[in-house]
Interface confidence: low
Amino acid sequence: TIPPHVQKSVNNDMIVTDNNGAVKFPQLCKFCDVRFSTCDNQKSCMSNCSITSICEKPQEVCVAVWRKNDENITLETVCHDPKLPYHDFILEDAASPKCIMKEKKKPGETFFMCSCSSDECNDNIIFSEEYNTSNPDLLLVIFQ
């Protein structure tokens, strides 16, 4: 994906279909790459990213990565193709309308990642266990 500060003109209205035949617009995602964050020990956080980008490719979804080590906390917001691994992990929740953080095993740090498929959905990252992808109601949410 092209970062927003060097992004070329991108068609806002190009769409493709996924494996289920669902029609996809290019996502509008928060896209600040890696920034320091104060998000810690909260059920959910806002990204505090002021950059919204139209993803380069229609199949891309929004991704957020939260990392904590001994020195700092960072939050990464990007567009990414769910067919490709990100940070060596598959985006298994890419169809979700909300960005529900899941912990991943990374040595030397606490690492959470989420992906989602509605406009700017990586602006609100959710850690609370009450949101669980095994909950069938989750995928019915249409943000209204």
Epitope: N11, I15, S50
Partner: antibody
Framework: EVQLVESGGGLVQPGGSLRLSCAAS????????MTWVRQAPGKGLEWVSV????????YYADSVKGRFTISRDNSKNTLYLQMNSLRAEDTAVYYC???????????????WGQGTLVTVSS | DIQMTQSPSSLSASVGDRVTITCRAS??????LNWYQQKPGKAPKLLIY???SLQSGVPSRFSGSGSGTDFTLTISSLQPEDFATYYC?????????FGQGTKVEIK
């Protein structure tokens, strides 16, 4: 119930300015991209501009680029269109419309306001 | 910009008739076409998106088909409330352009 109500239209002289507003209710405004579409008297529909839910991204039709500015105030659930350097050919009914989420209705405009008439004439 | 051409520009039909409106794109837009209905003095209403998907709340007598450059909106049995102007719109590339409209009038 989703509702979009435009206001701010009227008669303005060529070269003048006007600011349209669109008050939204019945849905969570801040996560929907919003568009303006216009229709000249007796003519067809013309897309004008789009703004992302946060307001961070905007796009414009070539015919209005540099003259019109789309913006939004999510705390007020309101969409705006600032129109400067108005021309006779900008005379139209201006509609605000909601862009659907892609897994909902693929970004087509699913809800429209009733429109507000802008007349540019000396 | 992609040009959208509708035909006919107007047609006269009776209640119960089967009505077909066509829309042609100046280049291939795959299946990325929407249909709207507009009545005089009213805002457009979304009928069909992605060429053939029926918008929620729209009667099943409306259907859409086509892909590439040629598309069709069909009203299987025209009802009194269907007399209106119909627009196609491509959502393949920016700007999302509309056809010039087809006015369906009472015969």
């Amino acid at each position: 119930e989703v509702q979009l109500v435009e206001s701010g239209g009227g008669l303005v002289q060529p070269g003048g300015s006007l600011r349209l507003s669109c008050a939204a209710s019945g849905f969570r405004f801040d996560i929907y991209a919003m568009t303006w579409v216009r229709q000249a008297p007796g003519k067809g529909l013309e897309w004008v501009s789009v703004i992302s839910g946060s307001g961070g991204t905007t796009y414009y039709a070539d015919s209005v680029k540099g003259r019109f500015t789309i913006s939004r105030d999510n705390s007020k659930n309101t969409l705006y269109l600032q129109m400067n350097s108005l021309r006779a050919e900008d005379t139209a009914v201006y509609y605000c419309a909601r862009r659907g989420q892609y897994r909902d209705i693929v970004g087509a405009t699913d809800y429209w306001g009733q429109g507000t008439l802008v007349t540019v004439s000396s | 910009d992609i040009q959208m051409t509708q035909s006919p520009s107007s047609l006269s039909a009776s209640v119960g008739d089967r009505v077909t409106i066509t829309c042609r794109a100046s280049q291939s837009i795959s299946s990325y076409l929407n249909w709207y209905q507009q009545k005089p003095g009213k805002a457009p209403k979304l009928l069909i998106y992605a060429a053939s998907s029926l918008q929620s709340g729209v009667p099943s007598r409306f259907s859409g088909s086509g892909s590439g450059t040629d598309f069709t909106l069909t009203i299987s049995s025209l009802q009194p409330e269907d007399f209106a102007t119909y627009y196609c719109q491509q959502s393949y590339s920016t700007p999302p352009t509309f056809g010039q409209g087809t006015k369906v009038e009472i015969k």
